[in-house]
């Protein structure tokens, strides 16, 4: 969690002189309670906005907006503490709006906003606006909190942000996977414009289960510049296990900006549909059983094998 740049942050508006300060998230009104405290914020809204740094990088930010209740307690409002808690790491960042002049009632409701908290793709935040001074220990709470879930890098607007681009969001491999026969799977995808290697991770599952019955990893060497943006195809050899028919193919790139932590893309091939109606039983019995060409439990190809081509 951080603030966007360290440029001058503004909270003044017509009729109010205000300054934005860093906060320890522990306003001194906790320690020295006041008798008269303002009511809580009204209509707290958090939206996803995007902002450029002075260096030109684009980051997702939490746009926080709230209004004041139209009661006499605004006469005792000395400011607000904005707090953002990142749920998964319990990291908290606060800023304080310090009012340097007293608020007066006017015809339009007072409205405040702040758009400088940089948020991470796919993360969840609790945003709290606390009016200051905070209430005495048994007083009614004068804060409002809301949760804010930031979309991940698959989201169209997020894709072009600096953190998402750094993890490879602009690469669309357009994966196609097809079963050639019971033992071969063909994977096609588009290479990105970087000389970096890829890994194809194949995980196979039984029809209705989540425990894998086969795993195979295939390495694709870095393409040459003339192969950038071209389709690459790989044929993977499956382990011939009966019922091991649902295949998940994941492609992991190793771009220089994200190394082994780049966004992965995946595609799944479902098990073939079982026929709804049973096969008709012939009205004669064959005199011999047809011989199967291969055993259902073939053990000599545990590792799986593969070959690949780049197409221009």
């Amino acid at each position: 969690l951080r603030l966007l740049d360290h440029r001058a942050l503004v909270c003044s508006q017509p009729g109010l002189n205000c300054t934005v300060k860093n906060s320890t998230c522990l306003d001194d009104s906790w320690i020295h309670p006041r008798n008269l405290t303002p009511s809580s914020p009204k209509d707290l809204q958090i939206q996803l906005h995007f902002a450029h740094t002075q260096q030109g990088d684009l980051f997702p930010v939490a746009h926080i907006e709230w209004t004041l209740q139209t009661d006499a307690s605004i006469l005792y409002l000395e400011g607000a503490e904005l707090s953002v808690l990142q749920l998964n790491t319990n990291e908290r960042l606060c800023v304080k709006f310090q009012f340097l002049s007293m608020l007066q009632h006017h015809r339009k409701r007072w409205r405040f906003s702040f758009s400088h908290f940089v948020v991470d793709p796919g993360q969840e935040y609790e945003v709290t606006v606390h009016h200051l001074p905070k209430p005495i220990p048994d007083g009614d709470p004068n804060h409002q909190s809301k949760n804010f879930l930031v979309p991940d890098c698959e989201h169209a607007r997020m894709k072009v942000t600096t953190p998402c681009m750094s993890s490879g969001s602009l690469w669309d491999p357009n994966i196609t996977v097809e079963t050639l026969d019971t033992q071969h799977l063909r994977v096609d995808f588009t290479l990105w414009n970087e000389s970096t290697h890829y890994q194809i991770l194949l995980t196979s599952f039984p029809h209705m289960e989540n425990h894998s019955c086969f795993e195979h990893m295939h390495h694709i060497p870095a393409p040459r510049p003339e192969e950038f943006h071209q389709r690459s195809n790989v044929t993977l050899t499956l382990r011939n296990l009966k019922g091991c028919c649902r295949h998940q193919v994941q492609i992991q790139p190793f771009f220089s900006s994200c190394l082994n932590d780049c966004l992965r893309h995946s595609a799944t091939v479902s098990c073939p549909e079982m026929p709804d109606t049973p096969e008709p039983i012939p009205d004669y019995m064959p005199l011999w059983e047809p011989r199967s060409g291969s055993s259902d439990y073939k053990d000599d190809d545990d590792k799986g094998s593969s070959h690949h081509h780049h197409h221009h």
Partner: antibody, heavy 118, light 107 residues
């Protein structure tokens, strides 16, 4: 001293209810999200639920969704887990745990035992 | 939901040995991974967070590495007091799933 103390465990029949409590001391409870984690006898750890500092974010494991309710009272420095429609597989030691700033859970209670059996 | 797997499920090693436990996430979780040690009859204790940051008070023989989907906990020189079950946990976003655990004992 930073401390978490769970209570409210006991024996209950399938379909019954229990309410677990966790009393926190030694830190600013209202600044932290809080978790419940459980461990069935002889099994591994299972994350159960999390509640954010101001209760605006709550998540549950699929295995307890719709049956368990997490809540907190910051004025009392207390965390709760209301468990309804209990099943045999809910038998476990239940821990409350505080997340560390930066990730993971660095403060755990001693646990309270819940036994669901007919 | 993202699945967490650990290997091996158990291991025996001699005092002084280098021990390595691996944890794999079914999808990338960046470095949002923690490791815990749990001794029999005790509550778990945090060893490593953010995949590689040592929790204060934890001996330096413990170390963590990895990012994305593959993570490793290493005990550089196994000590008798390290007999325990070790769990990884992902916390990129809820649910904050634990791995199934690796039981470590002394040969």
């Amino acid at each position: 001293e930073v401390q978490l103390v769970e209570s409210g465990g006991g024996s209950v029949q399938p379909g019954g209810s229990l309410r677990l409590s966790c009393a926190a001391s030694g830190f600013t409870f209202s600044s932290y999200s809080m978790n419940w984690v459980r461990q069935a006898p002889g099994k591994g750890l299972e994350w159960v639920s999390i509640i954010s500092s101001r209760s605006s974010i709550i998540h549950y494991a699929d295995s307890v969704k719709g049956r368990f309710t997490i809540s907190r009272d910051n004025a009392k420095n207390s965390l709760y887990l209301q468990m309804n429609s209990l099943r045999d597989e809910d038998t476990a030691v239940y821990y409350c745990a505080r997340p560390k700033v930066g990730g993971g859970m660095d403060v755990w209670g001693q646990g309270t035992t819940v036994t669901v059996s007919s | 939901d993202i699945q967490m797997t650990q290997s091996p499920s158990s291991l025996s090693a001699s005092v002084g040995d280098r021990v390595t436990i691996t944890c794999r996430a079914s999808q990338g979780i960046s470095n949002y991974l923690a490791w815990y040690q749990q001794k029999p009859g005790k509550f778990p204790e945090l060893l490593i967070y953010a995949a590689s940051t040592l929790q204060s008070g934890v001996p330096s023989r413990f170390s963590g590495s990895g990012s994305g989907t593959d993570f490793t906990l290493t005990i550089s020189s196994l000590q008798p007091e390290d007999v325990a079950t070790y769990y990884c946990q992902k916390y990129n976003r809820a649910p904050f799933t634990f791995g199934p655990g690796t039981k470590v004992d002394i040969k």
